[in-house]
Amino acid sequence: APTSSSTKKTQLQLEHLLLDLQMILNGINNYKNPKLTRMLTFKFYMPKKATELKHLQCLEEELKPLEEVLNLAQSKNFHLRPRDLISNINVIVLELKGSETTFMCEYADETATIVEFLNRWITFCQSIISTLT
């Protein structure tokens, strides 16, 4: 059974992940057209279901494409290097989802833009955090 200290650690990690994802989204939302139009041609795959920490496998598998987009479309005003940012996210995701059980991610048929993708995982984090508090 999870202890209060492990629950607190999970909550803090989720809050950190949430902040990282929100930071990326805020950066993208500051982009103007036609740059935003170009960025929205990148497609991301969404999980069929995302209600448990193990479902973070689906986020982990899309981190490489996310880094690629951020590298290619990086604004000179965006001071965090995409590689460092994604590396931080990857470490948190690996800790949160655990490595004991191998979970095969199932993706929805529809693809998503980077904005929809980030919003989906932001909502996921907020939802799990709310169940822990």
Epitope: T41, P65, A73, K76, N77, T111
Partner: antibody, heavy 121, light 113 residues
Framework: EVQLVQSGAEVKKPGESLKISCKGS????????IGWVRQMPGKGLEWMGT????????RYSPSFQGQVTFSADKSISTAYLQWSSLKASDTAMYYC??????????????WGQGTTVTVSS | DIVMTQTPLSLPVTPGEPASISCRSS????????????LDWYLQKPGQPPQLLIY???YRASGVPDRFSGSGSGTDFTLKISRVEAEDVGVYYC?????????FGGGTKVEIK
Amino acid sequence: EVQLVQSGAEVKKPGESLKISCKGSGYGFTNYWIGWVRQMPGKGLEWMGTIYPGDSDTRYSPSFQGQVTFSADKSISTAYLQWSSLKASDTAMYYCARQGRSYYYFGMDVWGQGTTVTVSS
Amino acid sequence: DIVMTQTPLSLPVTPGEPASISCRSSQSLLDSDEGNTFLDWYLQKPGQPPQLLIYTLSYRASGVPDRFSGSGSGTDFTLKISRVEAEDVGVYYCMQRIEFPLTFGGGTKVEIK
């Protein structure tokens, strides 16, 4: 080996329909836009538009909108270009080409060998 | 649509000598926020499909010899071949991909003198 293989040459009459194909292999076909390029006899290259096989999202160049249809079957890693009613002016070589995860951020790095379409009465 | 204009139309070259092709766009292909210039160069050898030579202004595509180089500013671009070889003959095209629809230049035919 990453490659795109196109269907063979076609000879058609005006008013007939046609569907040509472009099969990808050696990479994650669903994750890359596939562009279509026309080359009329003795002329230059014209970008017709592009399709994302992962969800069949299509973008047509205004010059080709309503003239052709792009489609894809991701289960067999194949993209298609079709005409419902061919005209003599559709006579050309048609190429498919891989355009990366975004057709804005990547050049066309892999090309099919081309399909010659001849429309004549 | 962005219009891409190439010069010259035809370029007779001598093997071992340098050659350059120009391309001009009707509007800037530079995104100053990103620092990306959305211009590519393709070579279509006789009887073959086009092949990507240079992407995003100056990056050589995989397997492309280093005798090919791309340069330029917002609207004026150059493809240089430091020492032309017989296998370099064909039609060279520039292409913009900063704006929809993507557009090609009319092509420059390079042939051996």
